[in-house]
């Protein structure tokens, strides 16, 4: 998606099938207010962006309302009347689901079921990562619905958990983004804890799968 034209790099993120963010990095035009023009239908006239993102006082992106649109975004980034980047992109290929909400934990002996609110669209994976201070890496389990049971836990150990949502690659393609992680929650003997002793700070989530 970041193909360059006249030195312009673009990034598209479709937040939760609600808002499309298109940002650009144009070293040649770093002190210029480039304008963003778009349409959702190949036959319509272009509209100009009304919600620009600014960086160091200059336009660097545009936010568009695009609630659950199964559309191609046609857009043109211009310097005055001169187009410096023109493209069309199928928006859903750059989907970033929202972070899981209402995450709950239900313990039964050596197993925990993690649930959260399913998003309003499908073909997603809900991933739970967990670790104890004795684990060198995060363990992971994922399901198509936000109802993930992890078995074989040690009731005496403290475990840290966090959850995220990913778009299925076979359905949405390879260019989507995972959601941000939910907050880390720590549990021991079926009870919530402030922290798990000796647990290293969780790594920042990567934007790759």
């Amino acid at each position: 998606q970041g193909g360059a034209a006249e030195g312009v790099q673009i990034q598209i993120i479709y937040f939760n099938l609600e808002t499309v963010q298109v940002t650009w990095n144009a070293s040649k035009y770093s002190r210029t207010n480039l304008t963003f023009h778009y349409r959702f239908n190949g036959d319509e006239a272009y509209d100009q962006c009304t919600n620009y993102l600014l960086q160091e006082g200059h336009t660097s992106g545009c936010l568009l309302d695009a609630e659950q649109r199964d559309d191609i975004l046609y857009f043109s980034i211009r310097n005055g009347t001169h187009p410096v980047f023109t493209a069309s992109r199928w928006m859903v290929y750059y989907l970033k689901p929202s972070s899981p909400k209402h995450v709950r934990f239900s313990w039964h002996q050596d197993a925990v079921t993690v649930t959260c609110s399913d998003l309003s669209y499908g073909d997603l994976l809900y991933e739970v990562q967990y670790r104890s201070p004795f684990d060198t890496e995060w363990q992971s389990k994922q399901e198509n619905t936000c109802n993930v049971t992890i078995e074989g836990l040690d009731a005496e150990k403290c475990y840290s958990f966090w959850v995220r949502v990913k778009a299925m690659e076979d359905v949405y393609g390879p260019d989507t983004y995972p959601s941000d992680w939910s907050e880390v929650t720590c549990w021991q003997r079926g009870e919530i804890r402030d922290a798990c002793a000796e647990t290293p700070t969780p790594p920042k989530p990567k934007l790759s799968k």
Epitope: D123, T145, M168, D170, V171, Y172
Partner: antibody, heavy 119, light 107 residues
């Protein structure tokens, strides 16, 4: 609007070959997975193969792998199904279908082309 | 291969009836299930994807549910145009497989 038009069907003798075509229009051909699905007369649907036109990756049901080959020509926005060593049980309507988004469920279907294998 | 078993294979119903069709997968397919409607001589039409999400333009009387191995397509109030054959299909793993179909006929 999205359109898929199959062609190339007809009557063919057992053991012979046939190449089906699926001409796509109304969308960016290289953005989607496209499939062949067949349906024998009075029977149910049977998935045959998939191709991702962007990279040419294919997957074919094992039972057709030795005889059927799925391919595409991006410059012509056309998908093909090469069928060799045809048998009477290959008699069916052959549909090409496009996924809803990049992959997944099949949202757009052609009208189908009938292949009859008979001596 | 994952087997998809639909039941019943056919049913008779009247306009206004609530109709339920079930589909059972031979192994866990998560929610990677689609439902299609097909009328004689026509290509199938997508109704439901990801087990429970209605495809755009599909009337709200059609709904899907289930995950794992057991799935249901429900038509809440059968309309004259709903008499057709319905297929479930899994897209969890290749080869993709369809159920054998359920024919909904007029009583």
């Amino acid at each position: 609007q999205v359109q898929l038009v199959e062609s190339g069907g007809g009557v063919v003798q057992p053991g012979r070959s046939l190449r089906l075509s699926c001409a796509a229009s109304g969308f960016t051909f290289t953005d989607y997975a496209i499939h062949w699905v067949r349906q024998a007369p009075g029977k149910g649907l049977e998935w045959v193969a998939i191709i991702r036109p962007s990279n040419g990756n294919t997957n074919c049901d094992q039972k057709f792998k030795d005889r059927f080959t799925i391919s595409r020509d991006n410059s012509k926005n056309t998908l093909y199904l090469q069928m060799n060593s045809l048998r009477a049980e290959d008699t069916a309507v052959y549909y090409c279908a496009r996924s809803r988004v990049w992959g997944g469920s099949l949202a757009y279907w052609g009208q189908g082309t009938l292949v009859t294998v008979s001596s | 291969d994952i087997q998809m078993t639909q039941s019943p294979s056919s049913l008779s119903a009247s306009v206004g009836d609530r109709v339920t069709i079930t589909c059972k997968a031979s192994q866990n397919v998560g929610t990677n299930i689609a439902w299609y409607q097909q009328k004689p001589g026509k290509a199938p039409k997508l109704l439901i994807y990801s087990a429970s999400y209605r495809y755009s333009g599909v009337p709200s009387r059609f709904s899907g549910s289930g995950s794992g191995t057991d799935f249901t397509l429900t038509i809440s109030s059968l309309q004259p145009e709903d008499f057709a054959t319905y297929y479930c299909q899994q897209y969890k793993s290749y080869p993709w497989t369809f159920g054998q179909g359920t024919k909904v006929e007029i009583k």
